[in-house]
């Protein structure tokens, strides 16, 4: 018995070969002897039943001259898994067709962190093995159900599942979209008074995107977090529902999600969490955003540089006179110099020598007041 493997929804070709390599009379039947189709000597394909009943069955007329009389079954269904009989030259050839199906749990669009379950449906009596390869090259194998917990952004793309049965294989390709922001976290460094822009690009594109979102903000100086803005998303158009009066936020009406603050102030420094709930999805997308604000000031004989917001302990804060060595450099959030000499002073926030934020302040001779450029 010849074995042919097929994929639901696609086509399968069941072979039937003549020893004489020329056109001859043949008939394809179901195992219960019902006729499917055949050729009875006039080179015309005769179907066994009503057109609607047999419209998925066909043969390759072009192959008949070469003594090949395949049965083509289109739009395969799971119930097509059975034995088919080809009758030609006073002999019967049995061909077993097994149709398989691999599906993703409920949806192919999954939120980051959710689980993906791939299920293999196979005909009774079959004992296939299945192995799936993720877009990032990770292999998972198992029985009829394969699970991947904690989906990551790199899991977005085409998953390839190979079903193996009796040394024959059939390959399935499933497109999985992991719904997430491009970055889990971002940090913005600004001098006091500068404009601030926050961007929240999504890592996926869909034709219609609908949902709602909110940005909660925990200012470093505040005891509790506060909702800064709530918005709706309808077919990729953003509409603001409610916005705090301080700060005066503006939000762009089209993707990627984008917010602007007119100016960076110490009282705004802190961490935000933007959540986006998508229609017909359980769970939410999250992106953390951090704002670090720097201020350089001179009061009487004290030149001070301060930063507010979530800074890493390894960041260095320095005060230096332009083109000179740093006068003071500490892993702290405030540094100062007493009786600074006149000139242009620089306050620098740096990470392993890379300057993240810089603020200049001009110190005038002691009889005048400082100038902040």
């Amino acid at each position: 018995k010849t074995l042919v493997l097929g994929k639901e929804g696609e086509s399968a070709e069941l072979p039937c070969e003549s020893s004489q390599k020329k056109i001859t009379v043949f008939t394809w039947k179901f195992s219960d002897q019902r006729k499917i189709l055949g050729q009875h000597g006039k080179g015309v394909l005769i179907r066994g039943g009503s057109p609607s009943q047999f419209d998925r069955f066909d043969s390759k007329k072009g192959a008949w001259e070469k003594g090949s009389f395949p049965l083509i079954i289109n739009k395969l269904k799971m119930e097509d898994s059975q034995t088919y009989i080809c009758e030609l030259e006073n002999r019967k050839e049995e061909v077993e067709l097994w149709v398989f199906k691999v599906t993703a749990n409920s949806d192919t669009h999954l939120l980051q962190g959710q689980s993906l379950t791939l299920t293999l449906e196979s005909p009774p009596g079959s004992s296939p093995s299945v192995q799936c390869r993720s877009p990032r090259g990770k292999n998972i194998q198992g029985g009829k159900t394969l699970s991947v917990s904690q989906l990551e952004l790199q899991d977005s793309g085409t998953w390839t599942c190979t079903v193996l049965q009796n040394q024959k294989k059939v390959e399935f390709k499933i497109d999985i979209v992991v719904l997430a922001f491009q970055k889990a976290s971002s940090i913005v460094y600004k001098k006091e008074g500068e404009q601030v822009e926050f961007s929240f690009p999504l890592a996926f594109t869909v034709e219609k995107l609908t949902g709602s979102g909110e940005l909660w903000w925990q200012a470093e100086r505040a005891s509790s977090s506060k909702s800064w803005i709530t918005f709706d998303l309808k077919n990729k158009e953003v509409s603001v529902k409610r916005v705090t009066q301080d700060p005066k936020l503006q939000m762009g009406k089209k993707l990627p999600l984008h917010l602007t603050l007119p100016q960076a102030l110490p009282q705004y420094a802190g961490s935000g969490n933007l959540t986006l709930a998508l229609e017909a999805k359980t769970g939410k997308l999250h992106q953390e955003v951090n704002l670090v604000v720097m201020r350089a000031t001179q009061l009487q004989k004290n030149l001070t540089c301060e930063v507010w917001g979530p800074t890493s302990p390894k960041l260095m804060l320095s005060l230096k006179l332009e083109n000179k060595e740093a006068k003071v450099s500490k892993r702290e959030k405030a540094v100062w110099v007493l009786n600074p000499e006149a000139g242009m002073w620089q306050c620098l926030l740096s990470d392993s020598g890379q300057v993240l934020l810089e603020s200049n302040i001009k110190v005038l001779p002691t009889w005048s007041t400082p100038v902040q450029p």
């Epitope: 601030v196 822009e197 503006q250 602007t260």
Partner: antibody
Framework: EVELLESGGGLVQPGGSLRLSCAAS????????MSWVRQAPGKGLEWVSG????????YYADSVKGRFTITSDNSKNTLYLQMNSLRAEDTAVYYC????????????WGKGTTVTVSS | AIQMTQSPSSLSASVGDRVTITCRAS??????LGWYQQKPGKAPKVLIY???SLQSGVPSRFSGSRSGTDFTLTISSLQPEDFATYYC?????????FGQGTKLEIK
């Protein structure tokens, strides 16, 4: 070719009402956001009101909020601007404009209809 | 609402001149800005969208650029048909706002 044609302008007394229409041809109306923009005699352009393609979200300039209402009828491919409590400063040429698919600019404009508010 | 400050309000130039018009936004607006040309008695026409994209059918002498919240429209070599009024429009968020306009006149 996409065309927009405004109508409904005219002379009205202060405190009166008027309804402007903008008939669109050559496009699937519900796909695009639409806006009304006006221009007072000898002055610059002023955005007045906007509506999302779905018709669910409407937006207004502060100068007309509470007095003007923007609506659309997708079956008639028509945009409307209901103007109530009209003032002399509402005197202008009113244009309707269609936005691009991604709300990125006003790519098609009508020729405008004139509204005069005077006693 | 976001304010758009356009300058200059009027400008005299000759055919062949290079001209620049600027708009400054009171808030960050990404690239969500368009430049429109209007001739007397006519509806405005889009020249540039998304700060620097040239609208189909618009001559390449028109170009747009952005630096932070400052936006510039440049006409590299003025042609007689370019004498008109130019407006910037922020479509970052509602309510949309136009600049005050720049009237470009023949010197």
């Amino acid at each position: 070719e996409v065309e927009l044609l405004e109508s409904g302008g005219g002379l009205v007394q202060p405190g009166g009402s008027l309804r402007l229409s903008c008939a669109a041809s050559g496009l699937t109306f519900s796909t695009f956001a639409m806006s009304w923009v006006r221009q007072a005699p000898g002055k610059g352009l002023e955005w007045v009101s906007g509506i999302s393609g779905s018709g669910e979200n409407t937006y207004y300039a502060d100068s007309v909020k509470g007095r003007f209402t923007i609506t659309s009828d997708n079956s008639k491919n028509t945009l409307y601007l209901q103007m109530n409590s009209l003032r002399a400063e509402d005197t202008a040429v009113y244009y309707c404009a269609k936005e691009g698919y991604n709300w990125n600019y006003m790519d098609v404009w009508g020729k405008g209809t004139t509204v005069t508010v005077s006693s | 609402a976001i304010q758009m400050t356009q300058s200059p309000s009027s400008l005299s130039a000759s055919v062949g001149d290079r001209v620049t018009i600027t708009c400054r936004a009171s808030h960050g607006i990404r690239n969500d800005l368009g430049w429109y040309q209007q001739k007397p008695g006519k509806a405005p026409k889009v020249l540039i969208y998304e700060a620097s994209s040239l609208q189909s059918g618009v001559p390449s002498r028109f170009s747009g650029s952005r630096s932070g919240t400052d936006f510039t429209l440049t006409i590299s070599s003025l042609q007689p048909e370019d004498f008109a009024t130019y407006y910037c429009l922020q479509d970052y968020t509602y309510p949309y706002t136009f600049g005050q306009g720049t009237k470009l006149e023949i010197k």
